[in-house]
Interface confidence: low
Amino acid sequence: ALDAAYCFRNVQDNCCLRPLYIDFKRDLGWKWIHEPKGYNANFCAGACPYLWSSDTQHTKVLSLYNTINPEASASPCCVSQDLEPLTILYYIGNTPKIEQLSNMIVKSCKCS
Amino acid sequence: ALDAAYCFRNVQDNCCLRPLYIDFKRDLGWKWIHEPKGYNANFCAGACPYLWSSDTQHTKVLSLYNTINPEASASPCCVSQDLEPLTILYYIGNTPKIEQLSNMIVKSCKCS
């Protein structure tokens, strides 16, 4: 799996999970989240050569097409596969609210 | 939806479905498929600005992050959403076989 266990231990130019810390205030302009101040969102990036963690048959077709036609505009892309939620604390007036924001943390990637 | 009905009628630089015809022999080097000779595989391409057909909350976070930090390498990507199968005819010896290859045709796209 193209997850932290593999990607953070290896120098990998191909599609892999990349570390990314997001500060809500600085990076997103969000001032409404009280806790946490930021989180490890991570992201997916890297090349998608033929058969590298291909998501679907179409991805395989597209990467093979791209191998034979390297200048073509059609090529697969490295995107998130497994995501996890993030629990946040915010206030409505003086009332604290705890909420789970779904699909906030990328755990693994794929070529799609 | 970022499908043919919308994308093929509009000139759209943002993430959208793009037409792509693949000739099995010429483009993929596949000689084993007897019929069809090729098919409209389509593909997804284009920019993913903030809130443009975002797949998940992480995609929204990433595109907003990318808007505020345009030099960052972390940005969403335009990928396939809905896919359809393709029915093919091939031979094993002199015996014709009809098979459905799943996820071969892209019908719509999303930013992920």
Partner: antibody, heavy 122, light 112 residues
Framework: QSLEESGGRLVTPGTPLTLTCTVS????????VNWVRQAPGKGLEWIGY?????SAYYASWANGRFTISKTSATVDLKITSPTTEDTATYFC???????????????????WGPGTLVTVSS | AAVLTQTPSPVSAAVGGTVSISCQSS????????LSWFQQKPGQPPKLLIY???TLTSGVPSRFKGSGSGTQFTLTISDVQCDDAATYYC????????????FGGGTEVVVK
């Protein structure tokens, strides 16, 4: 990957003329092709393009004077009513692919055809 | 429609010397970097040298350098060779108008 123009000849003013750009080594469903012209001793002038999706765009001065269309392996440029000012060498040029998106051409036209000469004279 | 104005022609350069050609656009090019430089010799089609304002096309000597952003761009040729004698054109890409592309008037480089 190559492009080659054909159809250039001597025509009288007002006689419609169609130039053809024949491509090989790449698919027109994945690439945008431009038409550019150059009058004798003058500079390059962008006429318009047809996108991989089949949409044609024209320079404002060229709108109505030219029509761009395509088949699976050719791109046509029709000069609807040529005048002497249309005397030029006409080139077709493909958008070079930059990165993963067809839109990211960065004004890069490559490769080009050798050109075809159109002379409009009475 | 955008107008691209180039350095008046001709420009003289000595073998081994350096020559700079400027290109000014009446409006910002798309993404501030949709600008290319072409070299053309008599009887030949233009040859792409630089795209994206500063990216050298494969096979083009590193003596050619593109710089600039937005509306002001420069092509610099260092260690000028006899083979560099040609006419150089800039081309800009634009969004939001029917005039998607425009060429500069050209600058002839004479090598002494």
């Amino acid at each position: 990957q190559s492009l080659e123009e054909s159809g250039g000849r001597l025509v009288t003013p007002g006689t419609p003329l169609t130039l053809t750009c024949t491509v090989s080594g790449f698919s027109l469903s994945s690439y945008t092709v431009n038409w550019v012209r150059q009058a004798p001793g003058k500079g390059l002038e962008w006429i318009g393009y047809i996108s991989y999706g089949g949409s044609a765009y024209y320079a404002s001065w060229a709108n109505g004077r030219f029509t761009i269309s395509k088949t699976s392996a050719t791109v046509d440029l029709k000069i609807t009513s040529p005048t002497t000012e249309d005397t030029a060498t006409y080139f077709c040029a493909r958008h070079m692919q930059v990165g993963g998106a067809p839109t990211g051409s960065m004004a890069a036209f490559d490769p080009w055809g050798p050109g075809t000469l159109v002379t409009v004279s009475s | 429609a955008a107008v691209l104005t180039q350095t008046p022609s001709p420009v003289s350069a000595a073998v081994g010397g350096t020559v700079s050609i400027s290109c000014q656009s009446s409006q910002s090019v798309y993404n501030n970097n949709y600008l290319s430089w072409f070299q053309q010799k008599p009887g030949q089609p233009p040859k792409l040298l630089i795209y994206g304002a500063s990216t050298l096309t494969s096979g083009v000597p590193s003596r050619f350098k593109g710089s600039g952003s937005g509306t002001q761009f420069t092509l610099t040729i260092s260690d000028v060779q006899c083979d560099d004698a040609a006419t150089y054109y800039c081309a800009g890409g634009y969004s939001g108008s029917s005039d998607k592309y425009a060429f500069g008037g050209g600058t002839e480089v004479v090598v002494k």
